[in-house]
Interface confidence: low
């Protein structure tokens, strides 16, 4: 009679993580008598996966009823596959022995490859805000994928970026891999509403890549532009001076009025108006009693934005020849937070 052969017809099996792997194995003969065992790996360090004779293997089920005497199908199913299950599986026929069974013949092995989806990319930006025209770095990380081949792209508002570096670790063989990429992005003044997107494409994603996003609103600081203008006279001895604070982001802003270098009033921007591009506008006004000044007055609008060094704009108020009354202004005295426009 021909000697028993252990046949593993599949050289390799590819399974998505979370699915069930079927490892096929048949014997060509019922003799010698003895159990089948499945191992991952070969040699002394091999790992027992299933023992027909004894043991508890909750993730493993047999394809056929091994209790049947005529059974020569020793295929198994392994459920809930993870990348850690990857490896080469051997179907081994044992000859019944005493006191122990003796290994008789092994199949050629089936390599189980696990396709594991990458984790959702996590994009993180710089710790501190930066202003337009500066270059900032964003990192993107994704883990746990297999096989190693993966494609990562960066986008800013749908436009692909080219200035980035990507590493996949580890370099050698592993059950799963991680990717780390750093992209450099040049900020522009219109970036408050912008997004940086890290897109990861992998065989497991079936053409539907994963994306991680970072809002540049968390990264950018758009400094305000100041414009100080003298409004028509409110009363015979009063002049209304406005400070228009335009196109700033984020909203955190404190404004101080100085008269000849002395602090007149400090206020915090509260009711601002949002532009289409996400920046804000705000206006403050100061009612100056001209009769209280003998000499010309230097009015300074000083703005501290988002904890940055103050910027200021000054206006020289000539007290000797101030214009006549031109109607009353609707603004309330000594308050300033008038909304400006939107974008």
């Amino acid at each position: 009679e021909e000697e028993l052969q252990v046949i593993q017809p599949d050289k390799s099996v590819l399974v998505a993580a979370g699915e069930t792997a079927t490892l096929r194995c048949t014997a060509t003969s019922l003799i010698p008598v003895g159990p089948i065992q499945w191992f991952r790996g070969a040699g002394p360090g091999r790992e027992l996966i299933y023992n027909q004779k004894e043991g508890h293997f909750p993730r493993v089920t047999t394809v056929s009823d091994l209790t049947k005497r005529n059974n020569m199908d020793f295929s198994i199913r392994i459920g809930n596959i993870t990348p850690a299950d990857a490896g080469t599986y051997y179907c081994v026929k044992f000859r019944k022995g005493s006191p122990d069974d003796v290994e008789f013949k092994s199949g050629a092995g089936t390599e189980l490859s696990v396709r594991a989806k990458p984790s959702a990319p996590v994009v993180s930006g710089p710790a501190a805000r930066a202003t337009p025209q500066h270059t900032v770095s964003f990192t993107c990380e994704s883990h746990g994928f297999s096989p190693r081949d993966i494609t990562l792209k960066w986008f800013k508002n749908g436009n692909e970026l080219s200035d980035f570096q990507t590493n996949v670790d580890p370099v050698g063989e592993s059950v799963s891999y991680s990717i780390h990429s750093t992209a450099k992005v040049v900020l522009t003044r219109e970036d408050v509403h912008s997004q940086v997107i890290c897109e990861v494409a992998h065989v497991t994603l079936q053409g539907d890549p994963l994306r991680g996003t970072a809002n540049l609103s968390e990264t950018i600081r758009v400094p305000p532009t100041l414009e100080v203008t003298q409004q028509p006279v409110r009363a015979e001895n009063q002049v209304n001076v406005t400070c228009q604070v335009r196109k700033f982001y984020p909203q955190r802003l404190q404004l101080t009025w100085l008269e000849n270098g002395n602090v007149s009033r400090t206020e915090t921007a509260s009711t601002v108006t949002e532009n289409k591009d996400g920046t804000y506008n705000w206006m403050s006004w100061l009612l100056v009693n001209v009769s209280a000044h003998r000499d010309d007055v230097k009015l300074t609008c000083q703005v501290e934005h988002d904890g940055q060094p103050a910027v200021s704009k000054s206006h020289d108020l000539k007290v000797s020849a101030h214009p006549k009354e031109q109607g009353s202004n609707t603004a309330a005295e000594n308050t300033g937070s008038n909304e400006r426009n939107i974008y």
Epitope: T188, E190, R340, I342
Partner: antibody, heavy 119, light 105 residues
């Protein structure tokens, strides 16, 4: 604030026109600029707008795909190119300064330039 | 779309209010045009702001999706068509009202 439009006149249907607005009296590069038109006996209609840096254009639905707005901050000019002209493009085209952006922030208007589309 | 009354009239010195209602517009401007085709003049922008060369009798307010232009102590020279401009934030669109003709009796 002065906004001076030019480039209007008699245009033929299917052709193109180029309107230019020359600005003075303010820091041009600090403001969005827009074009608004008014047909004969009609109301005002938003045409196009461009951000202060020139990087972001916005277009009204009536000209979307036919219009291109651009600006030259060095010359303090804003240009509107309108192609595939139709009779309904006839009207006075006004250049506006937008304090922030959108028609809700228009704070200054030019005198306008008249465009007549007719064969 | 935004809606404003076709016409309003008032005697000199009276207070005139013109409303402009939109679907979901958040911000408005008001523009005065004394004759068709002539250059409009912005009297109010961003709901409440008044250009420096506009008399203080012009004021603006907005509540919800409605804006109001108020002329306190209307004068004969205020006779004109007033257009409201609105930015609809939900549709990111810019629209003007059809105009309100103000007649000073």
């Amino acid at each position: 604030v002065t906004l001076d439009e030019s480039g209007g006149g008699l245009q033929t249907p299917g052709g193109g026109l180029s309107l230019v607005c020359k600005a003075s009296g303010f820091d041009f590069s600090n403001f969005n600029m827009a074009w608004v038109r008014q047909g004969p006996g009609k109301g005002l209609e938003y045409v196009a707008e461009i951000s202060d840096t020139g990087s972001t254009p916005y277009y009204g639905s009536a000209v979307q795909g036919r219009a291109t707005i651009s600006r030259d901050n060095g010359q303090s000019t804003v240009r509107l190119q309108l192609n595939n002209l139709r009779a309904e493009d006839t009207g006075t085209y006004f250049c506006t300064r937008n304090f922030g952006s959108s028609v809700s922030s228009i704070d200054a208007w030019g005198h306008g330039t008249e465009v007549i589309v007719s064969s | 779309a935004v809606t404003q009354p076709a016409s309003v009239s008032a005697n000199p010195g009276e207070t005139v209010r013109i409303t402009c209602s939109g679907d979901s517009s958040s911000y408005y401007s008001w523009h005065q045009q004394k004759s068709p085709g002539s250059a409009p003049v912005s009297v109010i922008y961003s709901n409440t702001d008044r250009p420096s060369d506009i008399p203080s009798r012009f004021s603006g307010s907005a509540s919800g999706s409605t804006a109001t232009l108020t002329i306190t102590g209307v004068q004969a020279e205020d006779e004109a068509v007033y257009f409201c401009g609105a930015y609809d934030s939900s549709s990111d669109s810019d629209i003007f009202g059809a105009g309100t003709t103000l007649t000073v009796l």
